[in-house]
Interface confidence: low
């Protein structure tokens, strides 16, 4: 299960960037190069590095020393370098109680963002800064340290007394001067004289605490073991040059035998423990791309079957000052169009073998919310909207307006703040919604800013399925179906009855259903029905019928 | 812009068989694409229409039963099949794509991209 950290106050601060490097790449160093900036059609940049094995030392600037997530080296190597107090020391009691550890949780994290393209440098003469991770504790890097500005070159290390012992050449005696420097930095020089010359060491001793570093041809898909030692060794059946073991397939092991005129017998047997091919591995963008506004999750994949044991294998990655022992990380609550940058590095059996550098910038964020200014109707047919954009990026406007179950939606240009809605019914309520959206990834859609307003009135449309029927020889019955639109607040049905150019009769009545009675005996009568919607009459219905004699 | 480039077109007896494609291409966020056809002296009429999100169809009472609209996300494409053509389904035929969102896909007006159409004549 990947970790999920939120980081809650998420500001941009100076990432630090790193020198590039070339193949292949010793298992120790920890200098990352640069991965290039973020490219949309990519999704994400990648650089995985490797760096030759005469370029293994690690620099360490100012910045990096003054950010109180840099991690302190607490491994003991072959060659002692002091260790640099950082900030972070005088934070930290002891050696032995150091809590700067690899973990999946980052409750306290915070996640800057790089700030911008200038944060990751790939030009040559750039500072440049190493990794900030912990070197391992059972293999440790060894490296050249640059000393920031704020340290002392004659501070010691806090968490060791390291003893330089230097032989002085004497004809009859081995007298040997020791500087011990402790934990206050005070130089303590002592002169001791012994009689008998010491007797040489083991090999099996001198070399038991070797460190190997592995380094990989992508070509001939091999290894070198790049044995970490001050002088030139021996090996047994000659399997090394230049304390280098070479063509080391992948998974295997290897017993490589090692002696030097400095120690005797037994001489150091190494068993050499072959991590799997670099290529065998990819750093994979897992993102979700509806959550990639504010979501990073990046996963090594296994691309290639190998032989090597899976359990041997460890993974960690670092984003910020957010460190993760997993194969998968998750990061959330990320700010939107940020440039992130996530170093990892894959170990085996505690050796680093490969390691890979991802600038992430995350998506498009939904837009804010637009501003309405005001939205009306000053006609029957039409009705106007302006509003301000939202202040985040955004590619278009959509516009939707409803009429009780109908619904229709525009996309407007980015670049429009009004928009005049045509034919509209009239006396009608139109609910507007408009939000903005981008098309990023997915399709993001900003909050809608919500108005509404009624159309003004307009004439009433035709009554319709009129009829006249005689009830009696001098009574007509009048009846008519409502209009289709009534277009107006009120509903009256109104009635008149011409005889000639005479009107005879006006009625008017909530219903379209008129009884005119007492009309003249065969006389030829106009009837004419229209509603009137308390605005406008509509057009009338016209219809002609004729009174019969009288039948008494 | 959505640039559509209607297919497929073309002579064919009464009681015959088409399928027209419309193909879609540049910024191809479209909600429905649509079929209208104008037959000579008429008004620009409704078809059939096809909402890309659900699935839905939405066709004239003239060609129910007779014509079926579907779409393929993977090509962008469009496709009206036309069965038991008569004479009177003689037309030019239009495609259309309309970027909003509707209850009503049948309305013209509506529809802010349209192709160059494709002529399809039905003898009897």
């Known amino acids: 299960q990947s970790p999920t950290p939120s980081p809650t106050g998420l500001t941009t601060a100076k990432m630090p960037s790193v020198p590039l490097s070339s193949d292949p790449l010793p298992t120790h160093t920890t200098a990352f190069s640069p991965a290039s900036t973020f490219e949309r059609e990519n999704d994400f940049s990648e650089t995985t590095t490797s760096l030759s094995p005469d370029n293994t030392s690690t620099q360490v600037s100012p910045d990096s020393l003054d950010n109180a997530s840099a991690f302190n080296t607490t491994g003991v190597s072959s060659v002692q370098t002091p260790h640099l107090p950082t900030h972070a020391d005088s934070q930290t009691p002891s050696a032995g109680t150091d809590t700067q550890t690899f973990s999946g949780s980052a409750a306290n994290a915070k996640l800057n963002p790089t700030p911008g393209s200038n944060a990751i440098s790939d030009v040559p003469g750039e500072r440049s800064t190493a990794s900030t991770f912990p070197t391992d504790p059972v293999s440790p890097l060894t490296t050249t340290l640059s000393l920031a500005h704020h340290s002392s070159a004659a501070l010691p290390a806090r968490t060791s007394n390291t003893t330089i012992t230097a032989n002085t050449s004497d004809a009859y005696l081995n007298a040997s001067e020791t500087t011990t420097l402790s934990p206050s930095g005070s130089a303590v020089i002592s002169t001791t004289t012994i009689a008998t010359t010491p007797s040489k060491p083991t090999c099996d001793e001198k070399y038991a605490n070797i460190t190997v570093d592995y380094l990989y041809n992508k070509e001939t898909k091999l290894f070198t073991a790049k044995l970490n030692v001050n002088e030139n060794v021996e090996c047994g059946n000659n399997t090394c040059t230049n304390n280098e073991v070479h063509n080391l397939t992948e998974c295997k092991n290897a017993s490589v035998s090692i002696s030097h005129n400095s120690c005797t017998a037994p001489d150091k047997t190494l068993i050499l423990d072959v991590p799997p091919g670099v290529e065998k591995f990819q750093l994979h963008d897992c993102t979700q791309v509806e959550k990639a506004d504010t979501t990073i999750c990046l996963k090594w994949k296994n691309i290639e079957t190998f032989t090597c044991d899976t359990q041997n294998i460890t993974y960690r990655f670092q984003c910020g000052n957010m460190i993760f022992d997993n194969k998968e990380i998750k990061l959330e609550n990320l700010e939107p169009e940020h440039e992130y940058k996530c170093d990892s590095e894959i170990l085996y059996n505690n050796h680093k073998f490969t390691n890979a550098s991802k600038i992430i910038k995350t998506d498009f964020g939904s837009p804010g919310e637009p501003q309405i200014i005001f939205c009306r109707s000053e006609a029957a047919h039409q009705g106007v909207i302006t509003w301000n954009p939202p202040q985040r990026s955004f590619h278009n406007f959509t516009l939707c307006y409803i009429k009780e179950t109908e619904k229709d939606c525009l996309n407007l240009d980015k670049n429009l703040i009004k928009y005049d809605l045509q034919n509209l019914k009239p006396y009608t309520k139109y609910v507007l919604s408009l939000h903005a959206y981008i098309i990023a990834k997915v399709q993001r859609n900003g909050s809608a800013a919500m108005c509404h307003f009624t159309t003004k009135s307009a004439p009433p449309s035709q009554v319709w399925n009129m009829t006249v029927s005689m009830t009696s020889d001098n009574s007509m019955h009048v009846k008519c179906r409502p209009p289709r639109d009534r277009n107006g607040p009120h509903e009256r049905y109104h009635l008149e009855v011409e005889a000639g150019n005479t009107l005879v009769r006006n009625e008017s009545h909530k219903n379209c259903d008129f009884r005119v009675k007492d009309l003249q005996y065969s006389t030829d009568y106009t009837f004419k029905a229209y509603f009137h919607n308390g605005d406008y009459p509509g057009e009338p219905f016209i219809l002609h019928h004729s009174t019969s004699y009288n039948s008494k | 812009e959505v640039q559509l480039l209607e297919s497929g077109g073309g002579l064919v007896q009464a009681g015959g068989s088409l399928r027209l494609s419309c193909a879609a291409s540049?910024?191809?966020?479209?909600?429905?694409t649509g079929w209208f056809r104008q037959a000579p002296g008429k008004e620009r009429e409704f078809v059939a229409s096809i909402r890309w999100s659900g699935g839905n169809t939405y066709y004239a009472d003239s060609v129910k039963g007779r014509f079926t609209i579907s779409g393929d996300n993977a090509k962008n494409t469009v496709y009206l099949q036309m069965n038991s053509l008569k004479p009177e389904d003689t037309a030019i035929y239009y495609c259309?794509?309309?970027?909003?969102?509707?209850?009503?896909?049948?309305?013209?007006?509506?529809?802010?991209?349209w192709g160059q159409g494709t002529q399809v004549t039905v003898s009897s």
């Open positions: 540049g910024r191809t966020l479209t909600f429905y």
């Open positions: 259309a794509a309309l970027r909003s969102w509707t209850t009503t896909p049948q309305r013209e007006v509506l529809y802010d991209n």
